[in-house]
Amino acid sequence: SWMWNQFFLLEEYTGSDYQYVGKLHSDQDRGDGSLKYILSGDGAGDLFIINENTGDIQATKRLDREEKPVYILRAQAINRRTGRPVEPESEFIIKIHDINDNEPIFTKEVYTATVPEMSDVGTFVVQVTATDADDPTYGNSAKVVYSILQGQPYFSVESETGIIKTALLNMDRENREQYQVVIQAKDMGGQMGGLSGTTTVNITLTDVNDNPPRFPQSTYQFKTPESSPPGTPIGRIKASDADVGENAEIEYSITDGEGLDMFDVITDQETQEGIITVKKLLDFEKKKVYTLKVEASNPYVEPRFLYLGPFKDSATVRIVVEDVDEPPVFSKLAYILQIREDAQINTTIGSVTAQDPDAARNPVKYSVDRHTDMDRIFNIDSGNGSIFTSKLLDRETLLWHNITVIATEINNPKQSSRVPLYIKVLDVNDNAPEFAEFYETFVCEKAKADQLIQTLHAVDKDDPYSGHQFSFSLAPEAASGSNFTIQDNKDNTAGILTRKNGYNRHEMSTYLLPVVISDNDYPVQSSTGTVTVRVCACDHHGNMQSCHAEALIHPTGLSTGA
């Protein structure tokens, strides 16, 4: 059910904030914001507004009891999630009450305000407002006058407006930041017998940029090893600034010195430090000491304080480069070599070179990382870096060999570098072509001469530059008096053709055809493959009907007179 009493409202409210009327409240409200309160009726949404979460009703305008003494409104409480009303819509009344015994009340118990430091006298700080609910037509009971009880000589208040202003020149935040001012509001025009109320105004001087950054020392010295990569922080410098916030923000820059191109300075936004970093690769052997002039400046400067001097400071930074024993450096990032697959053992493929970049120019020895050449196919001359074979190669087994060569300083074996070597094995014609598959075909007893009974395909493991070119022929021992011919199609295929009209499977059930396949590369490679041809009974469409199974089961004793 709804929980409220009749609402009364003091007329003639003059405050800057809305005037609190009362609270609509349902006993279904768990206080968790799950309900939404809705107001309708006289002046709803205009004269009277409701906080939809709390049910607090406020009057937005000055109300006049003589003009309208009663407002009739309706209230709803709705579940925010479902839209379901938790109470029936209900009517309530707001009565405008006219009383004459109210003291001025400030809209806030405590005000907080800010004003920039170093402000001119008379600068606006904040306006405090007190209201008196009495009838303003009744004497001066609603006439309020403001005065300052605490806070002089720093601040003053305008008696009629409640406007607080600065009253002292050059108030410096760096000396004092917080002020507590007590303001009194008195009705009856401030005369004796008037009622009064007070409020506290906590005033904070906000910072302006009236202090420059300053380095605590004129010279800084840092050391860094020559191996420091670009971006490496070398050291931090920090200028201090008595201001705060963006007025204390510092930007660091290198303005001069022979290290201008070699180093950078980055501003750390969190700590306001300048971080000196390496910009380019250093070389102890070339230059051992750099001097920089670093400047700290405020990015945001207020022109009216420029008379105090420049808002920047500079310091000298001396950077000492420390020597580092560096590993050898190869002449290339990677080496690509090639060698024929028929190369003899100890054939030289190429060479690598590496040098110690240090001033000492320590001698270097070379070795193969055996993890990358487990089969020890390659070796290296430890003195001159020549790469040579230590085993025979086969391109058909492995086309590329990827190995790693190590260069090590002889005087300091801890200093070593590695480089990848990519060795390509070049093709040599060392494989004969052979049938792409095992061929077993059949011929019909009633076959006509020159009838194609099988197409042959070949493969070759080699990879000649101009592509494969195979030729096919009957083996010499089978060429004369053969019952079949080989027709080379000149496209790396060949056909087996019948050579006579009709075959008798009772006379000869199976023929074995030896076929020679040759490639066209140097040196020429060839192989002989055998094609089995079975004689079968066929229907008039040429579909096989039966063959002698013995041809498959007992191949011994078969004629090779193909």
Epitope: N79, R80, R84
Partner: antibody, heavy 117, light 111 residues
Framework: EVQLVQSGAEVKKPGSSVKVSCKAS????????MHWVRQAPGQGLEWMGD????????HYTQKFKDRVTITVDKSTSTAYMELSSLRSEDTAVYYC??????????WGQGTTVTVSS | DIQMTQSPSSLSASVGDRVTITCRAS??????????MHWYQQKPGKPPKLLIY???NLESGVPSRFSGSGSETDFTFTISSLQPEDIATYYC?????????FGGGTKVEIK
């Protein structure tokens, strides 16, 4: 401008889980309930559950109670819906929608979840 | 659970026609004069869009040819003059009681 932006499409195996996100902007995240509604291919709309971002109070439909978990991250104004023990019939477009007084006044663009072995 | 029966499941009408869709709840979805029934439009490949809330209130930005009425268990959604851009599926939804449920949808096509 109120916007609800959902995470991208997901392909999941049966038995696994999926977690769909919904990033809200253009309004005070904690002032409105966030709901999840799904729509199987060629089918109608099916309400799964909702959450009050300010208190993380949740409501789930009985059908999904043991498999669905709705959460929020107030710091990023993001709502999440995790559905576990997925089966092929969970293949659907999953929508987040802002709730206001029982109605869904703003919807996400939808996230397609495909459950397939 | 409150069952929402929407009819017809599909309809075909001409441009300019008056189109009416009904939605029946298995129990009352009204309380204290508030009817917790809402209507949505969904076009293919898009999320639904709120048209009518609390049975008869037009959502901001929605054309006035759309309207809704009804109370308790019987509700009606009307398009006073069908336009080509109204081709879509329309759904009713109740928020009276958990779980919130939708009607099966009505597919509206142009003849």
């Amino acid at each position: 401008e109120v916007q609800l932006v959902q995470s991208g499409a997901e392909v999941k195996k049966p038995g696994s889980s999926v977690k769909v996100s919904c990033k809200a902007s253009g309004y005070t995240f904690t002032n409105y309930w966030m709901h999840w509604v799904r729509q199987a291919p060629g089918q109608g709309l099916e309400w799964m559950g909702d959450i009050d971002p300010s208190h993380s109070e949740t409501h789930y439909t009985q059908k999904f109670k043991d498999r669905v978990t709705i959460t929020v991250d107030k710091s990023t104004s993001t709502a999440y819906m995790e559905l576990s023990s997925l089966r092929s019939e969970d293949t659907a477009v999953y929508y987040c929608a802002r709730g206001d007084l029982g109605r869904f006044d703003y919807w996400g663009q939808g996230t397609t979840v495909t459950v397939s072995s | 659970d409150i069952q929402m029966t929407q009819s017809p499941s599909s309809l075909s009408a001409s441009v300019g026609d008056r189109v009416t869709i009904t939605c029946r709840a298995s129990e009352s979805v009204s309380i204290h004069g508030t009817h917790l029934m809402h209507w949505y439009q969904q076009k293919p490949g898009k999320p639904p869009k709120l048209l009518i809330y609390a049975a008869s209130n037009l959502e901001s930005g929605v054309p006035s040819r759309f309207s809704g009425s009804g109370s308790e268990t019987d509700f009606t959604f009307t398009i006073s003059s069908l336009q080509p851009e109204d081709i879509a599926t329309y759904y009713c939804q109740q928020s009276f009681e958990d779980p919130w449920t939708f009607g099966g949808g009505t597919k509206v096509e142009i003849k």
